[in-house]
């Protein structure tokens, strides 16, 4: 549909440049206008197929939005559409032009939304909100949002553009892409993960002057793992016949664990299974009433001499299993009267 | 853990000022944001204004400009607020709540002060 | 200022049962909104953030959903403890505002 009689339509055209891309070219729009954007190569040379994309996740053409080889038009713009929109090559996903479109008829300064006057000055960029950019250490945990700001203002407004590691930041560096909001002076990531991990600049410059931020972003990350068991826990034990004994087994698991307590058998005068796996009895498994404490402990009463041998405490979760075992030996009650006559001291756990 | 204490109850006569407290513990004071944020009776919650207790900055709601001044003492992680001229349409309960910095939302709050204005 | 509407303002619902509560800005907020538990006597517990994160701790019975203007927020498997007042909190800009709340009472 053609636009109204109320809309004006602004034309931009970029060059084609070499191989390295160029500087985004800096366009304003009136909210209402008609954008439209050319990327026509040197001497009328053919680009190939094109696609268009808005801060690095491509345009899908609609009522609103009219997507051309080399040319794009959004009518009756917004503040929404303000951005980085860049004419790519279909196949290889070269830049071939690059636009900083900004959509006035806002608060130039973006934040500045608590009505405070922004100089109408001629002049540099400055902090509007200055006080919070010192903070320059975000440690965020994985799977969070995290959003970078830098209000600024100055006369003529100033552009803002983003670096990650000293390097231009486009959306196309990372999965789940970014979005660049020019009229907030800000930059979201979602979802962040340990290669996010960096630091994040943005510079604001005009023709007076330029200014610039660095924040360093860590992601906190507690990597899913298989359980921990406590060191030296079951700890072999000696017991008298007929007591008792408890065998102590400490999990440590970010998922939830499922824990069991097995005895190590022998079928037919063998250990292990042909597969080498050894034959084991499941003394204690989580039931609909056993707590994870209750599981961390063995309990033998009154034991006899068919208790003696190998037990394995055995934790598992979603990502993995852990497995410690400790050995029980079971002496009569004979044997524990003469080693008390002889060296004073009882064999009992 | 989290924490934010806030100073108890408010009685105050019309005219006067009244300067209430939010002792953070449990976390790095100069790191966050402050913000405060006012309840009246019956109404929605509104945002007042934030302070940095790292360099002592300031935002405020236009509307509370000439209402509220937000101050820090960093050694004792205490956040304050002073309303002054207090006027019936201030009776309400304050809240104190913490920024989140890598987002801009409010994580922790205070249980909250309640001010009565009456002669 | 953007405004927040939240609706509605009270509704009953049976433990067991599932709410939903909306709140609608008068502008584009870019998910950037969160949602609290607000019990008398109390200060506001954040439940999720940023339309869907749930808070670590909170259980996943509370969900969010939304985009652009319109924002939802959902309790199942109602249990007695989920009486409260709930509220939406907007925080896209430097000018936060906050829904009218939710008066939420157990059949």
């Known amino acids: 549909e053609p636009p109204g009689p109320e809309q004006r339509v602004v034309r931009r055209a970029a060059e084609v440049p070499g191989p390295e891309p160029s500087q985004q070219e800096q366009v304003a729009f009136g909210s209402g206008d008609t954008v439209e954007l050319s990327c026509h190569p040197p001497g009328g040379a053919p680009t190939g197929p094109t696609v268009w994309a808005k801060d690095g996740t491509g345009l899908v053409a609609s009522h609103r939005i009219l997507v051309g080889p080399q040319r794009l038009q959004v009518l009756n713009a917004s503040h929404e559409d303000a951005g980085v929109y860049s004419c790519q090559h279909r196949l290889t996903r070269r830049v071939l032009c690059h636009f900083s479109v900004r959509v006035t008829d806002a608060p130039s300064s973006g934040d500045d939304e608590d009505g405070e006057d922004v100089a109408e000055d001629t002049g540099a960029p400055y902090w509007t909100r200055p006080e919070r950019m010192d903070k320059k250490l975000l440690a965020v945990p994985a799977a969070n949002t995290v959003r970078f700001r830098c209000p600024a203002a100055g006369n003529p407004t100033p552009s803002i553009s983003w670096l990650k590691n000293g390097k231009e930041f486009r959306g196309e560096h990372r999965i789940g892409g970014i979005k660049l909001r020019h009229q907030q002076w800000s930059l979201v990531m979602e979802s962040v993960v340990p290669s996010d991990r960096g630091n994040y600049t943005c510079v604001v410059e005009n023709k007076f002057g330029s200014i610039r931020q660095t924040y360093t972003l860590d992601v906190l990350e507690r990597s899913p793992h298989r359980p921990i068991l406590q060191a030296g826990l079951p700890a072999n034990q000696t017991a008298i016949l007929g007591s008792d004994v408890e065998f102590h087994c400490k999990v440590y698991s970010d998922a939830q664990p499922h824990i069991q307590w097995l005895k190590h058998v022998e079928v037919n005068g063998s250990k292990v299974g042909p597969d080498g796996t050894p034959y084991v009895t499941v003394l204690k498994t989580a039931g609909a009433n056993t707590t994870d404490k209750e599981l961390e402990v063995l309990s033998l009463h009154n034991v006899t001499f068919e208790d003696a041998g190998e037990y394995t405490c055995l934790a598992g979760n979603s990502i993995g299993f852990s497995h410690h075992s400790a050995w029980l030996v079971v002496l009569p009650a004979e044997e524990e009267l003469m080693e008390t006559d002889e060296a004073g001291s009882v064999y009992a756990g | 853990e989290v924490q934010l204490q806030q100073s108890g109850p408010e009685l105050v006569k019309p005219g006067a000022s009244v300067k209430m407290s939010c002792k953070a513990s449990g976390y790095t004071f100069t790191d966050y944001n402050m913000h405060w944020v006012k309840q009246s009776h019956g109404k929605s919650l509104q945002w007042i204004g934030y302070?940095?207790?790292?360099?002592?900055?300031?935002n405020y709601n236009q509307n509370f400009k000439d209402k509220a001044t937000l101050t820090v003492n960093k050694s004792s992680t205490t956040a304050y607020m002073e309303l002054r001229s207090l006027t019936s349409e201030d009776s309400a309960v304050y809240y104190c709540?913490?920024?989140?910095?890598?987002?801009?939302?409010?994580?922790?709050w205070g249980q909250g002060t309640s001010v009565t204005v009456s002669s | 200022d953007i405004q927040m509407t939240q609706s509605p303002s009270s509704l009953s619902a049976s433990l067991g049962g599932k709410v939903t509560i909306t709140c609608k800005a008068s502008?584009?907020?870019?998910?950037?909104i969160a949602w609290y538990q607000h019990k008398p006597g109390k200060g506001p517990r954040l439940l999720i953030h940023?339309?869907?994160t749930l808070q670590p701790g909170i259980p996943s019975r509370f969900s969010g959903s939304g985009s652009g203007r319109d924002y939802s927020f959902s309790i199942s498997n109602l249990e007695p403890e989920d009486i409260a007042t709930y509220f939406c909190?907007?925080?896209?800009?430097?000018?936060?505002?906050f829904g009218g709340g939710t008066k939420l009472e157990i059949k």
């Open positions: 302070i940095n207790p790292n360099n002592g900055g300031t």
């Open positions: 940023y339309t869907s």
């Open positions: 709540a913490r920024e989140r910095d890598y987002d801009g939302s409010m994580d922790f």
């Open positions: 909190l907007q925080y896209d800009n430097l000018l936060w505002t």
């Open positions: 502008q584009d907020i870019n998910k950037f």
